[in-house]
């Protein structure tokens, strides 16, 4: 017949659970409950990937692990009193009298509930480290945390080898015995320990609980150390760097926690389990029952099979672990989830040239002398397009792209960011926003929809200002339509005329070149150089600027370059900036220092890819460390990241221009990170690759 | 220690109804299942129901029609009804306990109280 | 109803010797669970049944262990390794594993 297979993963849950399976078959209870044993959780959940058992409840972390490695799936979840449905909130306290934001944890002194407790160690971990605030390498976290905070409290962490940092504030009983034991022996263990920490002065942050604060504060605290304390004097942090009152948590919080659930297989049947536990549920919650689900006290243990604060089951569902966990808790998870018996031992950087095969092997050797994990080790390939195929191929791991080619990496090949590039916030050379620029013209304004028979100015052919994103972005909106993947003639068709300078006129529409002008001497009209005058975004300003055309495609910054006294040039000298408007997608007009508002799209940093498979954090904490010894172009360490002046190339693994390498954040897919704009003008182009 | 009592007619007219109580110390019935077992001249226990802890009874289907199980947990209390009885309900009635601790064997019993059905 | 066969009906002892009641059932009492709900009680003369044995071979707290239960499936056995008068009464075997319970028909334990 058919039965349920429960795992359990000790001994007194094995009692439990054969009790439970007694108490089941004695009420009649269908189908039969057996009891599998397991030797932990983590094999429980191997188990039942292999179908040698059924179901199992889990928390949150393991609900993660289970979903993505082995495709479990939730169906029942654990409902508790006094908490908000299925759920709880993990937060950040801090005195409000502090300055103390979710930007500015670095170096202050924290207080935990407990090493690898879910809201006091867990849930902040995974937040800082999947929001690129703090950088593990080679999955070393305790390392990292102890690095980041100014000492703290962690119980539990005095076996660890950073005792010393982690368990700097703890202070244990009244006597001094049980210094970071992760027990009631030390004051500042769980949540009101963690509480206490803050609310003594030892730490400036508490991971607690939602509820924490208010339960012991305004009197309603026993103990003497928090009968004077007042809620109000205590805020939370939140996620956008703001603080909040401490009841305000739903709104600020680190993470929406789940409750624990009960995983299967995706083949079984979800609405079985929770009839079969709803069943039970109904005959063997209540005081004095024969069995009693949501109690473990007669077993001499807390929490076995179920959290003995259950109040009920319900069943769940949209049954995927994702939206059980919720995007809050996924995303924490996946910053704290780094097993190092899993991290690969090197990190197989793709090289494109000769210099560049230098500079890896430099850059591997510097990196081996510091101890940085994982290990360099480079590999060549011919183009961008091969190394994106042998990583995918799993033959090389990572590779440092520009836009375009982030698009292909992601598009065809499935590859993700890991980390990106971030340049000067003068630099407007590596990163910088396209924009229409246009004469203020009160009489003869047009916006962005009605270019058709207009005259275009353009830096020159295939510049990604100048022609890849406007002529995309025309395309994506529909405005050009080009016949038989015939791009130029549509644009030459769409244009009254234009200058599109161009390194191999042949079969190039006429009227392309009509604008141009070319040389003081009328010659090489329309070359891709500036022998034409027309040439570069400099170029297409002018060709705007003489009146030559109505619209030029640029960089944001050219207006500014040109105007004002910054260009002596005769044509440039007299100009001034606010004769000049942008035109913006939404059809409107804006002054030209609104270029961030309005745009045609943002040109993307250069990005670090590597396949959906990698850890990315261990990347960014390889890259993060080594820039601390090797990012500076000043720096005395025998290697410079950012620098490609020894290797007589430029540019070269990582632009010369890259200030610092950056965690992804959020935009941890290829469409993230080069942003809706931009992707829109790529799929304009490239749909008319035929 | 636990301890179960039986108490009711030992005659009961046929086409009646048969109602014994059974007093339970020692425990409490909001825990475990209450049972009753009747014993026929010539040996033949036959199981005729339970009233769990949690108030659900179950009944054997040969005598569905005719048995109720009550309960009163004020008096720690359990009761049998059957109607419309014959003379094959002659026999000793017995009250027990099944619980977790023995898999739900029956562990204490009560004494039994013998009825008989006549006119 | 699951039928429950027991032999002997009667078993003439003398005391100090060994004596062994069978069971047999109609069908496997095998739970699916795995495990085997067959029980045995004993009703002394003008007393109520008591436990002895529970789930084939478990003896009931205060049973002596000169009483012990064995067999799976369909068969099981009692055994009682030296008969003293305390032991006279009748013998009867249970089953819960499937719904409902039903007994032997009994031994009767006597002296010779």
């Known amino acids: 017949g058919m039965e349920v297979r429960w795992c359990a993963t000790s001994d007194p849950e094995q009692h439990k659970c054969g009790n439970m399976s007694e108490a089941f078959r004695e009420a009649g209870i269908q189908p039969s409950l057996l009891c599998v044993r397991g030797t932990s959780a983590d094999h429980c959940v191997q188990l039942i990937a292999a179908q040698e058992a059924d179901a199992i409840t889990l928390d949150g972390g393991a609900i993660y692990e289970a979903g993505k490695e082995h495709g479990l799936k939730p169906v029942v979840g654990e409902v508790y009193d006094q908490e908000v449905g299925t759920s709880y909130y993990a937060v950040a306290v801090v005195r409000r009298s502090s300055h103390v934001t979710i930007d500015t944890l670095k170096g202050v002194k924290s207080c935990h509930t407990g090493i690898n407790r879910t809201v006091g160690w867990n849930v902040p971990v995974g937040y800082l480290v999947e929001s690129g605030r703090l950088s593990v390498m080679g999955c070393d976290v305790l390392k990292a945390v102890s690095d980041y905070f100014g000492g703290s409290c962690v119980p539990g962490a005095g076996e660890t080898s950073y005792s010393e940092s982690l368990c700097r504030l703890c202070r244990g009983d009244s006597s001094g015995e049980g210094v970071c034991d992760k027990s009631p022996l030390e004051r500042y263990y769980d949540y009101s320990g963690a509480f206490r920490c803050l609310a003594e002065g030892a730490g400036d942050v508490a991971f607690v609980k939602h509820s924490t604060v208010l339960e012991n504060t305004d009197g309603k605290t026993l103990p003497s150390w928090g009968q004077a304390l007042l809620s109000q004097d205590f805020e939370l942090l939140c996620r956008d760097g703001s603080r909040a009152d401490v009841t305000e948590w739903r709104q600020c919080h680190l993470a929406r926690v789940p409750a624990h659930a009960v995983v299967v297989r995706a083949d079984t049947d979800g609405g079985l389990i929770f009839r079969l536990l709803n069943e039970g549920q109904r005959l063997f919650s209540h005081e004095g029952s024969s069995f009693q689900m949501f109690s473990s006290e007669a077993y001499g243990q807390k929490d076995l099979l179920f959290k003995d604060s259950t109040s009920e089951l319900v069943p769940i569902a949209t049954q995927t672990y994702e939206a059980w966990l919720g995007h809050e808790y996924l995303h924490a998870m996946k910053g704290l989830l780094c097993d190092p018996n899993r991290l690969p031992p090197y990190l197989r950087w793709c090289v494109l040239s000769t210099p560049e095969i230098q500079k890896c092997g430099d850059m591997a050797v510097a990196f081996r002398r510091q101890r940085l994990k994982p290990e360099i080790q480079c590999v060549s390939a011919k183009s961008p397009q091969h190394c994106m195929e042998r990583i995918q191929a799993e033959q090389v791991d990572a590779v440092t792209l520009s836009g375009e080619d982030i698009y292909t990496a992601g598009k065809t090949y499935g590859l993700v960011p890991a980390a990106g590039e971030h340049y000067a916030p003068e630099d407007s050379s590596n990163s910088y926003y396209v924009v229409a620029v246009v004469r203020r013209d009160s009489s003869h304004a047009f916006t962005l929809d009605e270019l058709r028979g207009k005259r275009s100015c353009h830096a020159g052919f295939g510049s990604p200002a100048g022609w890849d994103v406007p002529v995309g972005a025309l395309i994506q909106r529909g405005f050009i339509r080009p016949k038989d993947c015939d791009v130029l003639t549509a644009v030459s068709e769409f244009f009254n005329a234009s200058c599109v300078p161009v390194n191999n006129p042949k079969n190039y529409p006429s009227s392309l070149c009509a604008l141009c002008v070319g040389d003081e001497q009328g010659r090489n009209k329309c070359v891709g150089n500036s022998q034409e005058r027309y040439y570069g975004y400099r170029g297409a300003f002018r060709c705007l600027v003489e009146n030559a055309g109505d619209v030029a495609f640029v960089r944001h910054t050219t207006v500014f370059d040109n105007t004002n006294g910054h260009n002596s040039e005769p044509w440039a000298a007299e100009l001034r900036s606010e004769d000049y408007e942008l035109l913006c997608p939404n059809g409107a007009r804006a002054e030209v220092s609104q270029f961030a508002a309005c745009n045609l799209a943002q040109i993307p940093p250069h990005a670090v890819m590597v396949r959906p498979d990698t850890n990315i954090f261990t990347v960014y904490g390889l890259l993060d460390k080594a820039q601390d010894l090797f990012g500076d172009d000043h720096n005395k360490n025998g290697f410079k990241m950012f620098d490609s002046s020894n290797y007589h190339g430029q540019d070269l693994l990582f632009k010369d221009a890259t200030v610092r390498a950056v965690p992804v954040g959020e935009k941890t897919t290829y469409r993230g990170w080069l942003g809706l704009d931009y992707v829109a003008a790529l799929e304009g182009m490239s749909s008319q690759q035929c | 220690e636990v301890q179960l009592q039986e108490s009711g007619p030992s005659l009961v007219k046929p086409s009646q109804t048969l109602s014994l109580t059974c007093s339970v110390t020692g425990d409490s019935i909001t825990s475990g299942y209450w049972n009753w077992i009747r014993k026929f001249p010539g040996n033949k226990l036959e199981y005729m129901g339970y009233?769990?802890?949690?108030?659900?009874?179950y009944y054997n289907p040969s005598l569905k029609s005719r048995i109720s199980i009550t309960r009163d947990t004020s008096k720690n209390q359990y009761y049998l009804q059957l109607n419309s009885v014959t003379a094959e309900d002659t026999a000793t009635y017995y009250c027990?306990?099944?619980?977790?601790?023995?898999?739900?064997?029956?562990?204490?019993w009560g004494q039994g109280t013998s009825v008989t059905v006549s006119s | 109803d699951f039928v429950m066969t027991q032999t002997p009906l009667s078993l003439p002892v003398s005391l100090g010797d060994q004596a062994s009641i069978s069971c047999r059932a109609s069908q496997s009492l095998v739970h699916s669970n795995g495990n085997t709900y067959l029980h045995w009680y004993l009703q002394k003369p003008g007393q109520s049944p008591k436990l002895l044995i529970y789930?084939?071979?478990n003896r009931f707290s205060g049973v002596p262990d000169r009483f012990s239960g064995s067999g799976s499936g369909t068969d099981f056995t009692l055994k009682i390794s030296r008969v003293e008068a305390e032991d006279l009464g009748v013998y009867f075997c249970?089953?819960?594993?499937?719904?409902?319970?039903?007994f032997g028909g009994g031994t009767k334990l006597e002296i010779k």
């Open positions: 009233i769990s802890d949690s108030g659900i009874t």
């Open positions: 027990a306990r099944r619980t977790l601790a023995t898999y739900y064997a029956m562990d204490y």
């Open positions: 789930r084939v071979s």
């Open positions: 249970s089953q819960s594993t499937h719904v409902p319970p039903t």
